[in-house]
């Protein structure tokens, strides 16, 4: 019995269906096929879990969190024992192993390993202003998404004809901040932050209104 080399890793967007490949060749009939799919979760590597089991011509559920979401892609028994996971969750990220036995066929490699990474687009970011909006002050525009795998980068732009930030602005695309020094009336306006990663983008808006001092009445 020989389990074929798998592609190494599968990436899927959260909520979508992942297909984890596993196929084998055997010299025996598939009368005593036994397949166990296990996962070593990234979030808890010390706690391997059973995903799904095929034994004695029957399928059995694994860990509770996979119930109703996992199945074999084809009719069993078969030499293609790939599985699907519906409605993938972040917690599904991990290393998946298919363990195949088909007595009396012995020897050879009976384990296939595939990594699953569940990707998450940036969630709706929060746009905030830090600091006083008084003329001449320094302000920081903050943008942050609670979720996003891979970690999002952030790009700020001013929603005027140029989409350029004021000349006194410095941007940190990793932290999601823009520092605008010595704000003037020209700094006022609508700013947009775009959070992006490999599978998506999200945006938020912020209105910066520079407050000019009231002229003193004599």
């Amino acid at each position: 019995l020989e389990v074929s080399e798998s592609p190494g890793s599968v990436q899927v967007a959260r909520g979508q269906t992942a297909v984890l490949p596993c196929a084998f060749s055997t010299s025996a009939a598939l009368l005593n096929l036994n397949v166990i799919w296990m996962v070593i979760p990234l979030s808890n590597a010390n706690q391997p879990e059973q995903v799904i089991l095929y034994q004695g011509g029957q399928m059995f559920d694994g860990a509770l969190r996979f119930h109703g979401r996992v199945g074999f892609t084809g009719t069993m028994p078969a030499t293609n024992v790939s599985i699907f996971i519906n409605n993938t969750q972040l917690s599904d990220t991990g290393t998946y192993q298919c363990l195949v036995n088909n007595l009396p066929d012995r020897g050879g490699r009976n384990i296939g390993v595939t990594g699953l990474t569940v990707l998450v687009p940036p969630s709706a970011p929060q746009c905030q202003i830090q600091g006083s909006q008084d003329l001449g002050s320094d302000v920081i525009l903050l943008c942050s998404s609670e979720e996003g795998i891979p970690r999002p980068t952030y790009l700020w732009e001013k929603l005027d004809n140029t989409l350029k930030l004021p000349p006194t602005a410095t941007q940190d695309q990793v932290q999601g901040t823009v520092t605008i020094r010595n704000i003037s009336a020209l700094s006022s306006g609508l700013y947009q932050c775009v959070a992006s990663n490999a599978i998506g983008t999200s945006t938020c808006l912020l209105d910066l209104q520079v407050i000019s001092p009231q002229p003193r009445s004599v």
Partner: antibody
Framework: QVQLVQSGAEVKKPGASVKVSCKAS????????MHWVRQAPGQGLEWMGW????????GYAQKFQGRVTMTRNTSISTAYMELSSLRSEDTAVYYC??????????????WGRGTLVTVSS | NFMLTQPHSVSESPGRTVTISCTRS????????VQWYQQRPGSAPTILIY?????PSEVPDRFSGSIDISSNSASLTISGLKTEDEADYYC???????????FGGGTKVTVL
């Protein structure tokens, strides 16, 4: 009370322009962006753009760029939307709506009653 | 660019619960908040839900909003349906500088 009062219905010929007004009362006019949204008869809502009453800065939907002009007069707390080169498919009710940007996302918490613009030859 | 798709109409009896979906065609539903508006016949729209599930104080708690990642959609649920709930309902989101503010096509709710 807090309200947006729009100008009356208009009938225009194709190729003409129309200017709709929206007078705000009961709140600080310059403190909120004003948006314009239209609705063709029996159809859904279509966003046209915004104006910052404080600065006069505008942002228009791509579809209307070059044909729409949004202005304001802060002394009378009034926003205006002018649409040029009118065609029959511009027949719609035009709404002004006050925009809120709570945590970075537009929503419209106050609407005018709408102005019906009919384009007909 | 994405679109927001709503069912054209739904109908239900008074006292029952009705749910209206708003499906985002591409990109994640979590990427931008969703708002919901009610428009009664002959009237301007009014806000019901903002930022997915927040409800203005004047809106009855019979109206609630939620998000479902697996179907990439937002939903408006109206419980204890009343005849005065007969109206068109619109979802709305933001599509960045290229699209600006987007509305769904609207759903007509009929109370039987």
């Amino acid at each position: 009370q807090v309200q947006l009062v729009q100008s009356g219905a208009e009938v225009k010929k194709p190729g003409a322009s129309v200017k709709v007004s929206c007078k705000a009362s009961g709140y600080t006019f310059t403190g909120y962006y004003m948006h314009w949204v239209r609705q063709a008869p029996g159809q859904g809502l279509e966003w046209m753009g915004w104006i910052n009453p404080n600065s006069g800065n505008t942002g228009y939907a791509q579809k209307f760029q070059g044909r729409v002009t949004m202005t304001r007069n802060t002394s009378i707390s009034t926003a205006y939307m002018e649409l040029s080169s009118l065609r029959s498919e511009d027949t719609a009710v035009y709404y002004c709506a006050r925009g809120r940007l709570e945590r970075g996302y537009w929503y419209f918490d106050l609407w005018g009653r709408g102005t019906l613009v009919t384009v007909s030859s | 660019n994405f679109m927001l798709t709503q069912p054209h109409s739904v109908s239900e009896s008074p006292g029952r619960t009705v749910t209206i979906s708003c499906t985002r065609s591409s990109g994640s539903i979590t990427s931008n908040y969703v708002q919901w508006y009610q428009q009664r016949p002959g009237s301007a729209p009014t806000i019901l839900i903002y930022e997915d599930k927040e409800r203005p104080s004047e809106v009855p708690d019979r109206f609630s909003g939620s998000i479902d990642i697996s179907s990439n959609s937002a939903s408006l649920t109206i419980s204890g349906l009343k005849t005065e709930d007969e109206a068109d309902y619109y979802c709305q989101s933001y599509g960045g500088t290229s699209q600006g503010v987007l509305f769904g096509g609207g759903t007509k709710v009929t109370v039987l």
